[in-house]
């Protein structure tokens, strides 16, 4: 399909789907006129959809097709019939050619469960399409995909729990009508970015839901509220799990993916932060040892401010292949933060910061910044990042994450930005200052922090090394260290990763 | 055993347009993309764009999007490239090439190489 | 487009020598490099993908390494028919793109 790149309107940040003549396939109606013919006049016509059994890591081994009815090739690639079962669906294609996630994938299945049958699920002809049709035609790959499932079943020890979707953009949709229209219900769908575009606001058997296997799980990447959202932003698993906010990806800015702008386009950042919901799963598979932990929270202001890092009653969870089964909750939307590139796991820790008083404040936000120092590393300097305002005499909450162990936390540095970032805020300094012209500068008094990590669930307080100084103003620091009655352990559930 | 076979060597006049095949044997036809490089005189090799037999599926380097049409023959297991408006810019060696699915697979079997000429 | 750069363009060597030629992409293609060979009459060859593995049929002098942005073939114990031009080729993002060739000669 020549010409098929999509035009992304970059400054009204919507993007125009254009792709070139559709193939010679038809609309929904007359293809699934085709795939139900009876089985003698089926033969004329070649399927819309294949399925390459991988035998084998190597991409370049052409694996087996499987076709409904046949059981030679079954036996001919040593289908395992007991064991798990894993059917990669691939989403809208602008190339006609899988795209290099699908490889990744393959080969981190083959390599975390040796014995398992890898499917992938050819559906480029219906794909490789306009977008609109493309989505059309999803119903019809989820009933040719059913179709399969159905006659695998009519084999002895095949079981439909043993049957895990992936599904990709588009493919995660397909996955949803598939477990829809399959006789019975299978052991679990991932939805890896589920499209969002047609998508979006649905009715629940018209996308992805939790109704659509006994395990439903989602990564949402890419998704906006404003502009057009590629990836759905709605939760529609039993878990839907938003790493950094489900939109905005580390290492997918234009600076990060182009390198240099002569390198590429907006186009690139779009599939950077798209994909990383596959690379996210992929790491899931490939580094069990650092697994990921994903925590409940209503929306992701309150994640941001640290308020959401409790394991208690399932709030907390591993993302990607080791999330534990919560067929109990439905739509559970989980947040947690990621470094830019595999292994993603950070290290979560919520801080308390109880302002008891403060002087002058004016109309500007302080910056703060904190270090911390454990037994393992000391971190970096790290951001605390204000999403409301600081309030005086309450408990302000915040969130910081680190790329690394720090072990058993020391102590921890606060400091106090003093040149203002933006000249903004030097305006509203400037217009302070001329309102209130003797004003003694700006001081906050902290006596102590809360830490807790989400990954241990531990809790600690540390006070001020000096029980006599607990002002800081711009432009200073102040040192807390872990106070004396520091070790303080709720009894709170540590997220165990419980592998599948 | 795996092999392409590409046509005879073309001398055309400039306006012209040309139609190249490429025969495969020794494999699926199907199960495999076939994608065509240009080779200037004396220069780099280009990537023009490739065909999924499977389904007709294509995708040019835009570059190329108005020059060459990708078109297969399942029952005979041939693919062809069509150049339309030949200029001398044209005047190249042009190869077909066994591909497998992902981006990433390399073109694993070559054909031998077509030479066009294009001369007033 | 990325830019794949085959600094040598030509390269002069001794039979049973060892040479490396190498190449440059201008982003990170994740180790998505392949390997050609062409000989003089025009037959090209595919040798190493995805930076280190050997094509079936193509001799153990041949290896491929590298990761990120730079990428090496080497060609160790150098014979009679290995005398031909050799182009790296990218394949992570389209449009594929191939480094300018490096030409090896008899010294």
């Known amino acids: 399909m020549s010409n098929s790149v999509p035009l992304l309107c970059f400054w009204s940040l919507c993007y125009c789907f254009a792709a070139g003549s559709p193939v010679p396939f038809g609309p929904e109606g007359r293809l699934e006129d085709k795939l139900h013919k009876p089985k003698a006049t089926q033969t004329e016509v070649k399927p819309s959809v294949r399925f390459n059994l991988r035998t084998s890591k190597d991409p370049e081994h052409e694996g087996c097709y499987l076709s409904v009815g046949h059981s030679q090739p079954l036996e001919d690639c040593s289908f395992n019939m007991t064991a798990k079962t894993f059917f990669i669906i691939h989403g809208w294609t602008m190339s006609g050619i899988f795209e290099n996630w699908l490889h990744k994938l393959v080969s981190a299945l083959h390599t975390r469960e040796k014995d398992a049958n890898v499917v992938v699920v050819d559906w480029l002809p219906l794909a490789h399409q306009l977008y609109t049709d493309a989505v059309n035609n999803t119903r019809v790959v989820g009933h040719s995909i059913a179709r399969m499932l159905d006659w695998l079943q009519e084999k002895d020890d095949f079981s439909l729990g043993n049957v895990h979707l992936i599904g990709y953009s588009l493919g995660a949709h397909v996955a949803g009508y598939a477990g829809n229209f399959v006789k019975g219900t299978v052991g679990r769908i991932t939805g890896l970015d589920p499209a969002g575009p047609m998508f979006e606001g649905a009715d629940i058997h018209k996308r992805l839901s939790p109704d659509d296997a006994d395990f439903v799980d989602v990564l949402h990447t890419y998704t906006r509220s404003f502009g057009l959202s590629i990836g759905i932003q709605m939760p529609v698993g039993h878990i839907d799990i938003y790493p950094n906010g489900g939109d905005f990806q580390p290492g997918c800015g234009l600076n990060d993916v182009l390198g240099s702008i002569a390198y590429g386009t907006i186009t690139e950042v779009v599939k950077c932060e798209h994909e990383r919901a596959v690379h996210l799963f992929v790491d899931s598979l490939v580094n069990q040892d650092k697994p990921s932990f994903a925590f409940q929270c209503t929306d992701s202001n309150r994640f941001k401010k640290g308020i959401c890092l409790s394991c208690r009653k399932n709030r907390c969870n591993s993302i990607g292949y080791n999330a534990k089964k919560m067929r109990n909750k439905r739509n559970s939307k989980m947040y947690l933060k990621t470094r830019a590139g595999m292994p993603f796991r950070v290290y979560h820790y919520q801080m308390k910061i109880h302002v008891f008083s403060y002087k002058n404040m004016g109309e500007i936000e302080p910056t703060f910044y904190v270090t911390l120092y454990g037994t393992n590393a000391d971190s970096q300097t790290l951001p605390l990042e204000i999403v409301e305002r600081i309030e005086q005499n309450a408990t302000n909450t915040f969130l910081v994450y680190t790329e690394e162990d720090l072990g058993d936390l020391l102590k921890i540095q606060l400091t106090w930005e003093g040149a203002s970032q933006s000249w903004y805020n030097l305006w509203k300094e400037f217009r302070s200052y001329l309102s209130q012209p003797r004003n003694p500068g700006r001081e906050l008094n902290i006596r102590r922090i809360r830490v807790k990590s989400g990954e241990t669930q531990r809790k600690l307080t540390f006070c001020t090394e000096d029980p006599e100084n607990t002002s800081i103003s711009p432009g200073r620091e102040l040192w807390f260290r872990k106070c004396r009655d520091g070790w303080r352990m709720k009894n709170e559930t540590s997220p165990t990763v419980e592998l599948p | 055993e795996v092999q392409l076979q590409q046509s005879g060597p073309e001398l055309l006049k400039p306006g012209a347009s040309v139609k190249i095949s490429c025969k495969a044997s020794?494999?699926?036809?199907?199960?495999?993309?076939i994608h065509w490089v240009k080779q200037s005189h004396g220069k780099s090799l280009e990537w023009i764009g490739h065909?999924?037999?499977?389904?007709?599926?294509?995708n040019n380097n835009e570059k190329f999007k108005d020059k060459a049409t990708l078109t297969v023959d399942k029952s005979s297991s041939t693919a062809y490239m069509e150049l339309r408006s030949l200029t001398s810019e044209d005047s190249a060696i042009y190869y077909c090439?066994?591909?497998?699915?992902?981006?990433?697979?390399?073109?694993?079997?070559w054909g031998q190489g077509t030479t066009l000429t294009v001369s007033s | 487009d990325i830019q794949m750069t085959q600094t040598t363009s030509s390269l002069s060597a001794s039979l049973g020598d060892r040479v490396t030629i190498s190449c440059r992409a201008s982003q990170d293609i994740n180790n998505y490099l392949n390997w050609y060979q062409q000989k003089p009459d025009g037959t090209v060859k595919l040798l190493i993908s995805?930076?280190?593995k050997l094509h079936s049929g193509v001799p153990s002098r041949f290896s491929g390494s590298g990761s990120g942005t730079d990428y090496s073939l080497t060609i160790s114990n150098l014979e009679r028919e290995d005398f031909a031009t050799y182009f790296c080729q990218q394949g992570n993002t389209l449009p594929f793109t191939f480094g300018s060739g490096t030409n090896l000669e008899i010294k």
């Open positions: 020794g494999y699926t036809f199907t199960d495999n993309t």
């Open positions: 995805y930076t280190s």
């Open positions: 090439a066994r591909k497998g699915i992902y981006y990433s697979s390399p073109f694993d079997y």
């Open positions: 065909i999924n037999p499977y389904y007709g599926g294509t």
